[in-house]
Interface confidence: low
């Protein structure tokens, strides 16, 4: 999906008002220094691409993020403020439902959500700082 047509300011408002708090709730009890940020993004569309991937694509050791509150709110924000996003996600959602596992908060999931927090922060302050 091409995220360049999204309404970034509306998505930013959704993040600041609710998604950020849900991410903090998920990470509660975890030290902010526990995980190093290894995923970065340069522009807001690029950030949304990475956020979408980490939030909704199951990875080894963390298959359960898509049903978390922050993920559902992320999905809603993208569906509302990114034209045509919902249509591209129908098949992906159906496939995800078939392979949904029991909800478990693993260390790998905590690490992944820590990466998501970093990506969302970068979404609010875009532009890659490294050469």
């Amino acid at each position: 999906y091409d995220f360049t047509n999204c309404d970034f300011e509306k998505i930013k408002a959704a993040y600041l008002s609710t998604i950020s708090k849900d991410l903090i709730t998920y990470m509660s009890g975890t030290k902010s220094t526990e995980f190093n940020n290894t995923v970065s993004c340069s522009n807001r569309p690029h950030c949304l691409t990475e956020i979408q991937s980490l939030t909704f694509n199951p990875t080894a050791g963390c298959a359960s993020l898509a049903k978390e509150m922050f993920a559902m709110k992320t999905k809603a924000a993208l569906a509302i403020w990114c034209p045509g996003y919902s249509e591209t996600q129908i098949n992906a959602t159906q496939a995800m439902k078939k392979r949904r596992k029991r909800k478990v908060t693993t260390n790998k999931c905590l690490e992944q959500v820590s990466q998501l927090q970093g990506l969302w922060r970068r979404f609010n302050r875009p532009l890659l700082k490294q050469q």
């Epitope: 360049t4 340069s42 807001r44 569309p45 690029h46 875009p126």
Partner: antibody, heavy 117, light 107 residues
Amino acid sequence: EVQLVQSGAEVKKPGASVKVSCKASGYTFTTYWMHWVRQAPGQGLEWMGMIDPSDSETTLIQKFKDRVTMTVDKSTSTAYMELSSLRSEDTAVYYCARTLDGYYDYWGQGTTVTVSS
Amino acid sequence: DIQMTQSPSSLSASVGDRVTITCRASENIYSYLAWYQQKPGKAPKLLVYFAKTLAEGVPSRFSGSVSGTDFTLTISSLQPEDFATYYCQHHYGTPWTFGGGTKVEIK
């Protein structure tokens, strides 16, 4: 209305320094990055570097790392670009431009810097 | 660094002509390309960003497109006020680089 107003033209001798200012108005200064771009007479545009007004973090291209200092004064919403050890090839129009995603939606009017002995 | 190769460097056209300017990136920059118009003695003006999104207030005769690493700015019907120099610029990451410019002159 968003405006970036730059300081006036400067004439400098080789080896001297010049400090160009860029006063922003009409938006929240710390929300956008400030970039500096220069254009030598009859030439194209050359990106020099950028500063994040929220924390003053700067990124400069290699050729300017030793000679350029970018700063901001948040209290006056002003960005500064200082170029030292001036040489004749630094004669150019210097522009400030604001950005969020790397493209420039507003530019300053430009400041002409002439380096001549 | 990403190099932006812009062509042609200049062109002559008449009012009403369809004009196409191209820019090629040395590597994949996805849709992170902007186009600017500059008139003598003035600062550049943003026309297009994210390769194909028209900036606010820019006439619809301007359009941008992308195919791989090739980017195109098209002016569907050249107007007298369009005679200027046009620059492309990638905004994928640091360092930002511009194309060499295309001067559109009156035939």
